[in-house]
């Protein structure tokens, strides 16, 4: 016989990302003996929860918890049995629940209580279900991206830790109900609410972050639909030849469309709405989402929100990626420059429903929304955040890094399990997210 070296023991962590449109479960793993190294935590597996987001179960909280069961059962299989008790399990809810909490706090509490009850039935180390703030969502997405791309710290070939010179990447997340922009900045923020100080691996980071509620893809589409009903009676962003019955209650039930809600409307009434494939009118409709009229600071992005000039390279993920990837892959259009992105949006908006279906077969009706989505992404980046051609050249659209989904979930777990120490390697202390 001879000694055989055993593979290092693995630790696991589970995060349920309860988004506005759906919930995803991510299982992460890392070698137990290398907990404080960087870039060591990776995605082990993932699972998409069937049905809508947990906020869609406001009238049926037990349905929210029941929807999670399939993925939790998968987690029991994916995490070795002997590791169950030591595996932290978190649920973080984002803008869908933030909106529900604004309009119906009791329902929001009931949904969280229901999912908490279910999650405690499992043998994992359940550490809570809560609603993340927009600031947390932005910062944890930024942490995830930079952790995965090893921008915080690296182990050199001389056996020493060093901080890479390339600096950090900004992060842009486009969810269903909100969008976040987060990047490192040198000067203090004029609005303290949008500045976060981080201490990671002995380095200090000053980070600008802002979350725009109601500027997620799904809510933007609802707001455009409400505007189209109000001003046109047809939808300039939908393709010609596409028409559907719109239930007014669905359009106006969101707090995001409250401003467009008619005084007296029949929530059960259905209105037939048709597309007109009009890129110019669509652009005007999308422009109406942004206000540049007043800015109480030296500079703003939009809606009077302070934002320093965008600096450095950025990773744009979630619906940013899906929208741009659709233009690039399914439509075969170049999107390397802002000008090309605008031309691609116009191209999609010019397509009839017949043309669009023929180019992209086998798709659900949301195919009709890619024009509006593309127009919104282009306007948000160029007019909203102020990316010019040079700055846009530093934006990469990505879904994964190192085989791990880019989003807030990993950063959230890294923080809550103290997997990123505040101090340099060698010292063992937790992260300071002050």
């Amino acid at each position: 016989t001879r000694d055989v070296r055993e593979p290092p023991a693995l630790k696991y962590g589970i995060v349920l990302d309860a988004g506005s449109s759906h919930t995803s479960m991510f299982i992460y793993k890392w070698p137990a003996d290398k907990e404080n190294d960087t870039g060591i935590v990776g995605q082990h597996s993932s699972c998409d929860v069937p049905g809508g987001g947990i906020s869609s179960y406001a009238d049926n909280p037990s349905g929210a918890s029941q929807s999670l069961v399939g993925c939790l059962e998968q987690a029991l299989q994916d995490v070795p049995k002997e590791r169950h008790a030591g595996t932290p399990l978190y649920l973080g809810a984002t803008a869908g629940m933030r909106l529900l909490n604004l309009t119906n706090p009791e329902a929001s509490t009931s949904v969280l209580m229901a999912v908490t009850h279910t999650l405690t039935q499992y043998p994992f180390d359940f550490r809570g279900a809560r609603i993340l703030s927009g600031q947390e969502e932005g910062v944890f997405g930024w942490v995830t991206a930079n952790y995965l791309l090893e921008n915080f710290i690296k182990y050199g070939w001389v056996g020493r830790w060093f901080r890479p010179r390339k600096g950090t990447l900004g992060a842009m997340d486009l969810g269903g109900a909100s969008t976040q922009i987060t990047f490192e900045t040198t000067s203090p923020a004029e609005d303290r609410a949008s500045e976060v100080q981080l201490h990671l691996y002995g380095q200090h980071y000053r980070v600008y972050t802002h979350s725009f509620l109601c500027y997620g893809r799904d809510q933007v589409l609802q707001r455009l639909l409400a505007s189209a009903l109000q001003t046109h009676g047809f939808h300039p962003c939908w393709p010609r030849g596409f028409s559907t019955q719109v239930l007014l209650g669905d359009v106006y039930q969101s707090p995001c469309t409250m401003a467009q809600r008619p005084q007296n409307f029949n929530s059960s009434a259905r209105v037939s709405l048709s597309g007109s494939s009009d890129p110019h009118l669509c652009r005007d409709l999308v422009s109406g989402l942004f206000s540049f009229s007043s800015c109480p600071f030296s500079r703003c992005s939009f809606n009077g929100v302070f934002q320093p000039p965008v600096a450095g390279n950025f990773v744009a993920f979630s619906a940013f990626f899906y929208t741009v990837d659709f233009l690039r892959t399914s439509m075969g259009l170049p999107v390397a420059t802002l000008q090309q992105l605008e031309a691609a949006a116009v191209n999609v908006c010019n397509q009839t429903w017949a043309q669009l279906q023929a180019r992209v077969p086998g798709q659900r009706a949301r195919l009709a929304d890619y024009c509006a989505g593309a127009m919104f992404v282009q306007q948000l980046l160029s007019r909203g955040y102020g990316f010019d051609e040079r700055a846009f050249g530093g934006v990469i659209f990505q879904k994964k890094a190192a085989d791990t989904a880019v989003g807030w979930a990993l950063g959230y777990m890294l923080n809550l399990t103290n997997l990123i120490p505040a101090d340099p390697p060698g010292l063992r202390k937790g992260t300071d997210f002050s």
Partner: antibody, heavy 120, light 109 residues
């Protein structure tokens, strides 16, 4: 009733090319698309690429990119699939399938296929 | 890249219900299509858009799709239903049609 009629079986040498035709009889390509799908002996179905003749739009599976060319002649309602640099693994039945808007451009009409044998 | 996974084979007693599954990441967000292929023949579309039957396909054939699994259900299975069944879906990320590996249905008795 639209039918698709493909060209006959082919035996080819490794390294050569093959061009298979597919004619829509009793109909045209207006508003339709055509996909090419192959099936190696005893294996499953493998999508190769598609053409939307009335849009001049083609798409290819990454696996065949650079090796396959799909074209169409609208005047004769005929689609063509040319596969180059043939190897023995390309031995398969090659099907053309019509994609119909009524079925969200899934494959509603298939031909019986063309057997292509690649052998030295 | 996107993959669809099917069981290699499924057996069903004559007159009973057969269920063939097709799993893929978040497949419920995509439309699924099912094809029947008998030996030596071309495939035939039996279900489109998850659960719709083309004309000429018996009511015994039905489909469902949610979460990570789509299912083709054949009720009151007949000997003539013996065939290979393939699920298919369009992968938006790679702009391509994807087929499952196929399931051989055997009707016993």
């Amino acid at each position: 009733q639209v039918q698709l009629v493909q060209s006959g079986a082919e035996v080819k040498k490794p390294g050569s090319s093959v061009k298979v035709s597919c004619k829509a009889s009793g109909g045209t390509f207006d508003s339709y698309a055509v996909s090419w799908v192959r099936q190696a002996p005893g294996q499953g179905l493998e999508w190769m690429g598609r053409i939307v003749p009335w849009l001049g739009h083609t798409q290819y599976a990454q696996k065949f990119q650079g090796r396959v060319t799909i074209t169409a002649d609208e005047s004769t309602s005929t689609a063509y699939m040319e596969l180059s640099s043939l190897r023995s693994e390309d031995t398969a039945v090659y099907y053309c399938a019509r994609e119909s808007p009524g079925y969200r451009y899934s494959f509603d009409v298939w031909d019986q296929g063309t057997l292509v044998t690649v052998s030295s | 890249s996107y993959e669809l996974t099917q069981p290699l084979s499924v057996s069903v007693a004559l007159g009973q219900t057969a269920r063939i599954t097709c799993s893929g990441d978040a497949i419920g967000e995509k439309y699924v299509y099912w094809y029947q292929q008998k030996p030596g023949q071309a495939p035939v579309l039996v279900i489109y858009d998850d659960n719709n039957r083309p004309s000429g396909i018996p009511e015994r054939f039905s489909g469902s799709n949610s979460g990570n699994t789509a299912t083709l259900t054949i009720s009151r299975a007949q000997a003539g239903d013996e065939a290979d069944y393939y699920c298919a879906s369009y992968d938006l990320q790679q702009a391509r049609w994807v087929f499952g590996g196929g399931t051989k249905l055997t009707v016993l008795g």
